[in-house]
Structure formats: C-alpha cells, structure tokens
Interface confidence: medium
C-alpha cells in the first residue's frame, strides 16, 4: 500500500539534486584553491542533515550550521554584490568582474542556486513531488531558510562600499519583501559598512527616467539612512553596454553615461 | 554529441492511435527531461509536455490530457508519444526536444528531426 | 494560459545591417527568483527549432554574439547586429514561467 504523501503547491526537489549538489561541490573547490580543503562529502552530508527527515515547514537556521561550518569562507568584504530581482545579469557582471562577488559566486550560494529541496518527517527520504511554496504553504521550508541564513551572513559580512543591482522593471524597484528587502538590507553592519550604492538596471531602451528619484528608492534610502550608513544611486540605462564596458573599458563610447 | 532521431512520418486513419518514437544519444537520458511540442502546418510551436526519463513522472498541457500519452524505456534510451482518437486537426509534426537544465522551467536546447503525422481517411 | 504575441513578419532589412524581432506576453514573465523565463528560438526554412537566446538575455552555446537578447517583465527584444544570410527563417519567442508553456506565433525575418 503506497504511504501517504504530503502534497504540496511548489515544486519538488530538483531531479538529481544529491548528485547536483556534490559535483558543484567538488568543481567549486576545483576552481577555486582556498577552498580546496573542503571535504565535498562532509558538506554533502551536512546539507542534507539539515533537511532530511525533519518536516519541510519546520525548519530553522540552526539545522544549517552545521553546513555553515564547512561552507565558511572569506570573501573581500569591500567587493561585495548584491541584487533583487536581476540575478542573470548580476552573475554576468561578475564573471566579467571577477574581482566582485554576489552569493552565488560563494560556495555555499554555488551549491544551491536555482535549486530546490525538501524532505519528510520521519523518512529519510527527499521528496521530488512537490516542496512548499514560500507563500501558499509555509516560510520555514528548507529552501527559503537556506536562502534567509546564507544571505544574512553574507550581509554581515559586507564592508566599506557595498552596492546593489536593482531591477528597474520592476513596480517595486526596491522591495521590502525580497531577500535583498527583508534580509540583507537589515544586517549590513553599520560600523563596517560606509555606503550602499544601488544600480537601477533599466529595462526599455528608450527609457530616460532618473529612476533614483522612485518612491521605492526614496525608502530604501531612508531605511539605510537610519541605519548609519550612506546611500547612494546610480541609473544604469544601457545594460548591454554597461557589461560591453566592464568588458572593455577602453572602448571610446565608454566615457559617456551607461 | 547530443541527438535526438525520431521515427518515420506516420499516415494514419481517423480515430486511429500512433505512437512516435525519440531515441536520445550522446548524453545519458535520465539526466534531462524530454519536452514534446507540436508544429501545425505553417503554424507556430505547441508545449503538448514532458517526462522525466528518470521517474516517469508527466507534466502534460491541459489540452492534450487525454490525447498525449508520454512514456519513456530507459535501457534503449529511447522516449514514446502515443496519440489517440486521431483526427484532422492532430495532422501535424511532432518535435521532441531536450530539456536545457536540472530544473523544470528552462529551455529546450536540443530538438529532435521531428515526426510528421498525417490523419486522412 | 499566457499569451505571446509577436508580429508576423520584421521590417525587411539588408544584409550586413541590424534588425530587432519584438515579443510580448500577457504576463510578467519575471520570476522571484529574479529570472526571466523568457527564451528566443530560430526555426529555418524547412528545420528543426534552434534554442537562441536562453532567460531573456543569455547566449545559447554555439550561437553567434551577433544575437542577443533584452527587455522588462512584459516586453522582449531579439537584436541580430548583422544580418546574415542564414539568419533567414522564422523567430519564436517562448515562456518557461507558468505552465502550459506558451510560445508566440513567430515572426519571419525578411531580407531586403
């Protein structure tokens, strides 16, 4: 007789995602030599421990510490992206920009991004039918609480200039409820962190609008104001070409606004 | 390299059944999700849905439940479509296509030749 | 569902010279996850559909960087810098965001 199975509203576990997992884990450490000690299958290990058997809507940052552990890591805390709602051309930017880092260029955000998992209580096994939904289901599921813990200690671990990308497409440019919103914002470090500077991608070719003047900017820089720390801002109108002149700095129609 | 070599074109009568073949090489089948979309003549593309080689598991398009059944043999690497109660308006061509990622909203990044299906009495 | 809409036919252009395809869907295509599930296809005269462009702005492997791929959450634009003569056939745009996955109904590059 088949057991029961909790049904879910969002999907389930990535297909392969123990086997995803591991060899992000062992290319990561591949490419990157200070973190060649790591132990992938220790990390493997913890990863999972944090969610298998234990019920998808009760998790909680402590079942990640031991995977904290493992995954911890200096990154130049001057050097430091973040973005809301603009993840493809944060990571181009990046790759281009190898001196700068978003989470997913960190192992731990490495080995999850654009994954999904989830176990059940009591079994040890991980469910790919379905894995809670962020807003129909429950905010305690192993997903988000991963993305809530990395993303917090990232923040914290911010110094000296930090900027952001934004999605100036978006209604909300600035959103309180995205992780960047709710999360990253509150635990820069105001006595390491001297400005926020946000990058308002802009999304139509033709669109001239100083999008720093938003409502939604307004109150980011009211929150970060409040918190000690300056904020600044900057329209980015042209993406290709902001991302052609990273490439190529000195390229003549690079002196011109982007 | 990656293919995907689907079976001959198919004449089949009214209210008739046909059952497509996709066999996939160059990469291990269970490892990506196999799409299938069909392509009326002269017309544009349609998602009919996809299967996962590894499980069985089917995510299907409303529209062809009932009509679109998926299936997959994993020790020929090889993935089905079968059609049922055929009429004229299935007459079309039918691409499988590989799915880009390990997740299931990304792009299909190789098709196969496709399979053109005529129903005519 | 989600409807794409595309016009049926580009404004014919030369050889050598630029051209943009549009597509629009009904819907933000824009996950939370800040991806965009939009993608670019190429089907040429009497072939198979060719992935382009993948998540609105990224190359798909072994496609020339004389495409490339922008837009918002509603809005999408296929540049080709220069038109070459293979480039002929018909652009579909598709979403990945919510099923049924939808595609548009194809715009046919014309050459001048």
């Known amino acids: 007789v088949p057991r029961w199975r909790q049904q879910w509203s969002g999907p389930g576990t990535t297909k392969r995602f123990p086997e995803t997992v591991l060899a992000r884990c062992v290319k990561y450490t591949e490419i990157h030599p200070e973190m060649r000690h790591v132990d992938c299958q220790s990390v493997w290990d913890a990863f999972k421990g944090a969610f298998i058997s234990k019920h998808p809507c009760n998790i909680t940052e402590e079942d990640y510490q031991p995977l904290m552990k493992l995954g911890t890591q200096t990154v130049p805390c001057n050097k430091i992206l973040l973005w809301s709602r603009i993840k493809d051309l944060a990571h181009q930017f990046t790759q281009v920009q190898r001196d700068m880092f978003t989470l997913e260029d960190t192992l731990l955000g490495y080995l999850a991004d654009d994954l999904t998992w989830c176990g059940e209580f009591n079994t040890s096994k991980i469910n790919y039918q379905s894995c809670p939904d962020w807003r129909k289901d429950c905010s305690n599921n192993p997903v988000s609480v991963f993305w809530k813990t990395v993303s917090r200690r990232f923040a914290e671990a911010a110094c000296d200039v930090v900027h952001v990308m934004l999605n100036g497409s978006r209604s909300k440019i600035f959103d309180k409820n995205s992780t960047f919103g709710s999360v990253e914002v509150h635990n820069l470090q105001p006595e390491k962190v001297q400005t926020l500077e946000a990058w308002v991608i802009h999304g139509g070719r033709e669109d001239s609008r100083d999008l720093c003047q938003d409502p939604t900017i307004k109150e980011l820089e009211s929150i970060i104001s409040k918190r000690n720390i300056q904020f600044s801002c900057k329209n980015i109108y042209r993406p290709d070409k902001f991302l052609q002149c990273v490439k190529n700095p000195e390229d003549s129609s690079c002196t011109s606004e982007i | 390299e990656v293919q995907l070599q689907q079976s001959g074109p198919e004449l089949v009568k009214p209210g008739a059944s046909v059952k497509m073949s996709c066999r996939a090489s160059g990469y291990s089948i269970t490892d990506y999700n196999m799409h299938w979309v069909k392509q009326s003549h002269g017309k544009s593309l349609e998602w009919i849905g996809y299967i996962d080689p590894d499980n069985g598991a089917t995510n299907n398009n409303q529209k062809f439940k009932g009509k679109a059944t998926l299936t997959v043999d994993k020790s020929s690497s090889t993935a089905y479509m079968q059609l049922s109660s055929l009429t004229s308006e299935d007459s079309a061509v039918y691409y499988c296509?590989?799915?880009?990622?390990?997740?299931?909203?990304?792009?299909?990044?190789?098709w196969g030749q496709g399979t053109s299906v005529t129903v005519s009495s | 569902d989600i409807v794409m809409t595309q016009a049926a036919f580009s404004n014919p252009v030369a050889l050598g010279t630029s051209a943009s395809i549009s597509c629009s869907s009904s819907?933000?295509?824009?996950?939370?996850?800040?991806?965009?599930?939009l993608h670019w296809y190429l089907q040429r005269p009497g072939q198979s559909p060719q992935l382009l462009i993948y998540?609105?702005?990224n190359l798909a492997s072994g496609v020339p960087d004389r495409f490339s791929g922008s837009g918002s959450g509603t809005d999408f634009t296929l540049r080709i810098s220069r038109v070459e003569a293979e480039d002929v056939g018909v652009y579909y745009c598709a979403q990945m965001v919510e099923r049924p996955w939808t595609f548009g109904g194809g715009t046919k590059l014309e050459i001048k």
């Open positions: 296509a590989r799915s880009e990622g390990y997740q299931y909203y990304y792009a299909m990044d190789y």
């Open positions: 998540r609105m702005s």
């Open positions: 819907k933000s295509l824009l996950h939370s996850n800040g991806i965009t599930y």
